[in-house]
């Protein structure tokens, strides 16, 4: 089981958009996987800020909630094992490590459940 995101770091200019793809390969279990996106900001690298989820509409942390509701930040499912995170207008505080997490409560499986990529906002 492997979660694949683009090779980083990614560089984008503030005010522009970014799309970060994520797909899971070599997995066992349901064909339709759930995805969660987190941001780890440089000033708090051990704090996972929930951005958006394919499963839970209440997943977003307060810092992202209004932008998710407005559709500025969204997760789009491409297929059962692939999604893309879209952020319409990047802000300086969007810089950090983005984690694509494929949550599982099934203890039968083995592998890696996340992929991470750094985004730098210029």
């Amino acid at each position: 089981r492997e979660v694949l995101v683009p090779e980083g770091p990614l560089y984008r200019v503030a005010g522009t958009a970014v799309s970060i793809s994520c797909n899971v390969t070599g997995y066992e279990g349901p064909a339709q996987q759930n995805f969660e996106w987190f941001l780890y900001r440089p000033e708090a690298p051990d704090t996972a800020l929930g951005i958006v989820s394919t499963k839970d509409t209440q997943f977003s942390y307060a810092v992202f909630k209004s932008r998710v509701v407005a559709g500025e930040v969204q997760v789009q499912r491409l297929q059962g094992d692939a999604v893309v995170l879209k952020i319409a207008r990047l802000q300086a505080q969007d810089a950090g490590i983005y984690e694509c997490h494929t949550p599982s409560t099934d203890t039968r499986y083995l592998g890696s459940y996340s992929g991470k990529v750094e985004l730098r906002v210029l």
Epitope: G26, E99, T105, R108, Y109, G111, S112, Y113
Partner: antibody, heavy 115, light 107 residues
């Protein structure tokens, strides 16, 4: 009853080889990932290797990569660990265990690497 | 690789005591954390999985909590059969890694 039973341990000289087996019963073997975990005398637990239920993906600790090979035969409900180029530091009890959260363990088989 | 740091490495307690063991991961592992108990000469036994889920057949005096990087195993009232060594383990990514263990001894 869900059970794992290891075999194949023993005394081997440095540089030698050994093949461990783990016979599973009481559950659908092919539905579970499996792992080998070892414990050197008086020490803690060290994960050695793992394999997905289908056998399609294998994983290794850096300490054994290139020397050990994990495999499984789902038709025989058996997990294997082929250990080559054995070193003194590989001396340990080797356990097979089920899943990602290792919910079922065998009783272990002792591997001693010594001249 | 993800490092798992357990503390304390050993502790002395009496029957009936409340015992707390902590485990810290070197990076966020969400809730992919298990706890095991091992008695001398025996294989480890799973107590807690997914950080806080009690394995079937395990007494309710055992509980787990935490998420992210910091986790806790609590034994609410220590029983004679609980004197053993306890290990945490992450299954968030391979290689799976264990904490160094906590030996719970009789005071």
């Amino acid at each position: 009853e869900v059970q794992l039973l290891e075999s194949g341990g023993g005394l081997v000289q440095p540089g030698g080889s050994l093949r461990l087996s783990c016979a599973a019963s009481g559950f659908t073997f092919s539905s579970y990932a499996m792992s080998w975990v070892r414990q050197a005398p008086g020490k803690g637990l060290e994960w050695v290797s793992g394999i997905t239920g289908s056998g399609g993906s294998t994983y290794y600790a850096d300490s054994v990569k290139g020397r050990f090979t994990i495999s499984r035969d789902n038709s025989k409900n058996t997990l294997y660990l082929q250990m080559n180029s054995l070193r003194a530091e590989d001396t340990a009890i080797y356990y097979c265990a089920r899943g990602g959260a290792l919910d079922i363990w065998g009783q272990g088989t002792m591997v001693t690497v010594s001249s | 690789d993800i490092q798992m740091t357990q503390s304390p490495s050993s502790l002395s307690a009496s029957v009936g005591d409340r015992v707390t063991i902590t485990c810290r991961a070197s990076q966020v592992i969400h809730n992919y954390l298990a706890w095991y108990k091992q008695k001398p000469g025996q294989a480890p036994k799973l107590l807690i999985y997914s950080a806080s889920s009690l394995q079937s057949g395990v007494p309710s005096r055992f509980s787990g909590s935490g998420s992210g990087t910091d986790f806790t195993l609590t034994i609410s009232s220590l029983q004679p059969e609980d004197f053993a060594t306890y290990y945490c383990q992450q299954s968030y990514s391979t290689p799976l890694t264990f904490g160094g263990g906590t030996k719970v001894e009789i005071k």
